[in-house]
Interface confidence: low
């Protein structure tokens, strides 16, 4: 693995893609929603340490920013570095529809 | 201003684009800039509390999610939306260079 | 504009094996699940297998289940059905149809492809 | 499993009149807020058709005439006023859990 993506702090601990499941209820979606009941929900969620999957110039300077200042500037964050798209059937005022979501599933992370 | 721009933590609290102020040594760039000798950074900072900026559909569900499991899912983080573009004057092995970067000064924030 | 084109079809003998292919375009495959439908002489409908997007959930009627296997390709757009064991009673025009979700319907078919398993 | 017994088998309606088919499953396929149960038209030559999704939602460019009804385990195709090319196989299927199931089928003809 580059060096980029071996974490310092051990496996699984920093930024990576996990998968959540969740009911329509957990979504808060159940009174517009129809389709699928539950969701495999990916989502990125650990810590950016020091040159972990840094998405950009900006990244490199929180980073360095936070070592410096760490109660003025937070650490880089773990989101989604793109996101694969998701179908969901809806209510609508005349019946249901199918809509496409490009921005709900997240497909892999990085650090911002 | 919208309801998702209004911080229900109060003035400032809130997910929003912050000036630093930072030397190259602060950047850790002092090796390889030549100028500018200090940057104004922007960048993004401060909590995202429900509906407050949320990017997309997956911020939603990541907030949902939160305050049902907060000890799995983390909120949603404060992160740039778009970026400002920056020149620098770079030291190369031949002599100096100007260089755009498109990525490293945050134009504008949300939530993801 | 939605299209399924199966392909092959044949005559197996008992016991004998056949794969089913389905080429799918005018949807982006890779988000929906797909699922085979067969028709038989008498027209009776009957749910074979279904499997999800990504292909990691996949169901089996009783009927078939440890003799069809069901599989896709998303990067080439196609779902499969790997019959083997096959019986008289397979039989059937087979249908690739499109599923969306493990509660939904179909709202897509092809428009089938003939397998006669006869001695 | 859920088996779907559709009735009649098969009926002769004159045009311009109702037909109604009843499909009749042998436990609940409905939740406490959606039906999971579609029906479709089948043409002879032709794959089936899905008409009505989730007991009474029309799928987009299905005519008015067709509607759906019912919940837990009692559904209902009505077509009114009956056409000429409404002539067909009505299957009702439903989709609450696997195995997915379909009902025998109603071959309705037009007089």
């Known amino acids: 693995a580059r060096n980029g993506d071996r974490c310092p702090l051990g496996p699984g601990r920093c930024c990576r893609l996990h998968t959540v499941h969740a009911s329509l209820e957990d979504l808060g979606w159940a009174d517009w929603v129809l389709s699928p009941r539950e969701v495999q929900v990916t989502m990125c969620i650990g810590a950016c340490p020091s040159q972990f999957r840094e998405a950009n110039m900006h990244a490199q300077i929180k980073m360095n920013l936070h070592r410096l200042k760490p109660d003025t500037v937070p650490a880089p964050c773990c989101v989604p570095a793109s996101y694969n798209p998701m179908v969901l059937i809806q209510k609508t005022d005349t019946g249901v529809s199918l809509q496409t979501y490009d921005d709900l599933l997240a497909k892999d992370c990085h650090c911002v | 201003a919208r309801n998702g721009d209004r911080c229900p933590l109060g003035p400032g609290r809130c997910c929003r684009l912050h000036t630093v102020h930072a030397s190259l040594e602060d950047l850790g760039w002092a090796d390889w800039v030549l100028s500018p000798r200090e940057v104004q950074v922007t960048m993004c900072i401060g909590a995202c509390p429900s509906q407050f900026r949320e990017a997309n559909m997956h911020a939603q569900i990541k907030m949902n999610l939160h305050r049902l499991k907060p000890d799995t899912v983390p909120a949603p983080c404060c992160v740039p939306a778009s970026y400002n573009p920056m020149v620098l004057i770079q030291k190369t092995d031949t002599g100096v260079s100007l260089q755009t970067y498109d990525d490293l000064l945050a134009k504008d924030c949300h939530c993801v | 504009d939605v299209k399924l084109v199966e392909s092959g079809e044949g005559l197996v003998k008992p016991g004998g094996s056949l794969k089913l292919s389905c080429a799918a375009s005018?949807?982006?495959?890779?988000?929906?699940?797909m699922s085979w439908v067969r028709q038989t002489p008498e027209k009776r409908l009957e749910w074979v297998a279904y499997i999800s997007s990504g292909g990691d959930n996949i169901y089996y009627a009783d009927t078939v289940k440890g003799r069809f296997t069901i599989s896709r390709d998303n990067a080439r757009n196609t779902l499969y059905l790997q019959m083997s064991s096959l019986k008289s009673e397979d039989t059937a025009m087979y249908y690739c149809?499109?599923?969306?979700?493990?509660?939904?319907?179909?709202?897509?078919w092809g428009q089938g492809t003939t397998l006669t398993v006869s001695s | 499993d859920s088996v779907l017994t559709q009735s009649p088998a098969s009926l002769l309606v004159s045009l311009g009149q109702r037909a109604t088919i009843s499909c009749r499953a042998s436990k609940s396929v409905s939740t406490s807020t959606y039906s999971y149960m579609h029906w479709y038209q089948q043409k002879p030559g032709q794959p089936p058709k899905l008409l009505i999704k989730y007991a009474s939602y029309l799928e987009s460019g299905v005519p008015a005439r067709f509607s759906g009804s019912g919940s837990g385990t009692d559904f209902t195709l009505n077509i009114h006023p009956v056409e000429e090319e409404d002539a067909a196989t009505y299957y009702c299927q439903h989709s609450r859990e696997f195995p997915w199931t379909f009902g025998g089928g109603t071959k309705l003809e037009i007089k």
């Open positions: 005018g949807f982006t495959f890779s988000s929906y699940a």
């Open positions: 149809t499109r599923a969306l979700v493990e509660n939904a319907y179909f709202d897509y």
